[in-house]
């Protein structure tokens, strides 16, 4: 293959591969907890946004989908499933509803929502 | 790697790989002819929509972007850059403007536009 071309992955079959991360958009609506469980069952996690550059494909995502960001009421911070804190200036967080979970919306927006509301979701698997 | 996982590609560096097709969304606005030239310079073509199943990632694309579909006034058909005719029921063609070129819009819509209008564009490379 040409030097300018490369393989991406490995990823679960029929997932999107971009800059060696794997993504899948799930069409069925689940609450945040069910969405998290679905991703975990596929050795993945809900979407984690860590870089506007490495994840610029997310700019053009239509609609809004559960991601792995949750509000920790005790200290008021937003953190990812892996326990890391949301970096400043990565997401524009907008309170659409009183809640402790967040939907990913295009152009790096995070919509605060009630965790029990059903929504579509994005799973992500980082390749090693 | 697990049997359920696989590599995707090969694709140009930092392109999106999905079901062994390569896609890139270009942010700068160009007219249809300039967009075509830009894709060709990268050994690719403007987006060709050939399968709702193999290209279901296109459902979730926000906004609208030049694709490789042009109107042939002599016979009234729509055809791709490679000369193949648009398959029926693949795209909902909507006349936004008098024109002979088409923009891809989410959920498999094609917006007819004047070819000289600048828009963002999608390049595609099919892997062998």
């Amino acid at each position: 293959i040409p030097l300018t071309e490369s393989y991406c992955g490995p990823c679960p079959k029929n997932w999107i591969c971009y800059k060696n991360n794997c993504y899948q958009f799930f069409n069925e609506s689940k609450n945040w907890y069910e969405s998290q469980a679905s991703c975990m069952s596929q050795n993945a996690s809900l979407l984690k946004v860590y870089s506007k550059e490495d994840q610029d494909l997310l700019k053009l995502v239509k609609s809004y989908h559960w991601m792995g960001l949750v509000h920790i009421p005790t200290n008021g911070s937003w953190q990812w499933e892996d326990g890391s804190i949301l970096s400043p200036n990565l997401l524009t967080i907008i309170e659409m509803q009183k809640g402790d979970c967040a939907l990913y919306a295009s152009s790096f927006k995070g919509y605060i929502e009630n965790c029990s509301i059903p929504n579509t979701y994005i799973c992500m698997q980082r390749t090693v | 790697i697990p049997l359920t996982e696989s590599y995707c590609g090969p694709c140009p560096k930092n392109w999106i790989c999905y079901k062994n097709n390569c896609y890139q969304f270009f942010n700068e606005s160009k007219n249809w002819y300039e967009s075509q030239a830009s894709c060709m310079s990268q050994n690719a073509s403007l987006l060709k929509v050939y399968s709702k199943e193999d290209q279901d990632l296109l459902k979730l694309v926000k906004s609208y972007h030049w694709m490789g579909l042009v109107h042939i006034p002599t016979n009234g058909s729509w055809q791709w850059e490679d000369g193949s005719i648009l398959s029926p029921n693949l795209l909902t063609i909507i006349e936004m403007q008098k024109g002979d070129c088409a923009l891809y819009a989410s959920s498999f819509k094609g917006y007819i536009e004047n070819c000289s209008i600048p828009n963002t564009y999608i390049c595609m490379q099919r892997t062998v």
Epitope: I93, M96, S106, E113, I117, N119 | S106, S107, K109
Partner: antibody, heavy 115, light 108 residues
Framework: QVHLQESGPGLVKPSETLSLTCTVS????????WSWIRQPPGKGLEWIGH???????NYNPSLKSRVTISVDTSKNQFSLKLSSVTAADTAVYYC?????????WGQGTMVTVSS | EIVLTQSPGTLSLSPGERATLSCRAS???????LAWYQQKPGQAPRLLIY???SRATGIPDRFSGSGSGTDFTLTISRLEPEDFAVYYC?????????FGQGTKVEIK
């Protein structure tokens, strides 16, 4: 491009319920949050509330006890109900989508509350 | 709720002049969650600026937004005849979302 069209009665009697519907021109009902905003004659704009395609609604506390916003994804429509109306509810009512802000608006429908 | 106060109430200017519109919030608007809209008589408002400074699609570059915290500004660098209208600011940093009372830009 998304187009929005409000519909409903232009005249409502005091103490009755105002009902409006907003029809979305394409299949984008599941792509955005959908809002209602009103503007009394010669005055400014007031956000009433919004709803997601899954039915999660948020209302302006000043109207919360009287307002219900619902969505019907199968018809590409969302609706506003405002109960126990008075003359103070006379306004142009707009529907709008929320993306980066209120990006796309309907043309508005004038509702007069009068007996 | 956050109260937005716009000034001046009316701005009388000639085409080609620069217009500066102010929007002051009663408390800090988090992360510059402020939008500007233009409304002409008998029409719906049109989004001009979001995120305090980002121009909406199709908005000419003579429109610019700036500011943070409690003080925001919409600037029209050279007024065109079609720019004479009422302008509203709106915050979406905290619920309920609120609008300013508007500034009318009229022909002098």
């Amino acid at each position: 491009q998304v187009h929005l069209q409000e519909s409903g009665p232009g005249l409502v009697k005091p103490s009755e319920t105002l009902s409006l519907t907003c029809t979305v021109s394409d299949d984008s009902i599941s792509s955005y949050y959908w809002s209602w905003i009103r503007q009394p004659p010669g005055k400014g704009l007031e956000w009433i509330g919004h709803i997601s395609y899954s039915g999660s609604a948020n209302y302006n506390p000043s109207l919360k006890s009287r307002v219900t916003i619902s969505v019907d994804t199968s018809k590409n429509q969302f609706s506003l109900k405002l109960s126990s109306v008075t003359a103070a509810d006379t306004a142009v009512y707009y529907c709008a989508n929320w993306d980066d802000a209120f990006n796309i608006w309907g043309q508005g429908t004038m509702v007069t509350v009068s007996s | 709720e956050i109260v937005l106060t716009q000034s001046p109430g009316t701005l009388s200017l000639s085409p080609g002049e620069r217009a500066t519109l102010s929007c002051r919030a009663s408390q800090s608007v988090s992360s510059s969650y402020l939008a500007w809209y233009q409304q002409k008589p008998g029409q719906a408002p049109r989004l001009l600026i979001y995120g305090a400074s980002s121009r909406a699609t199709g908005i000419p570059d003579r429109f610019s937004g700036s500011g943070s915290g409690t003080d925001f500004t919409l600037t029209i660098s050279r007024l065109e005849p079609e720019d004479f209208a009422v302008y509203y600011c709106q915050q979406y940093g905290s619920s309920p979302w609120t609008f300013g009372q508007g500034t009318k830009v009229e022909i002098k």
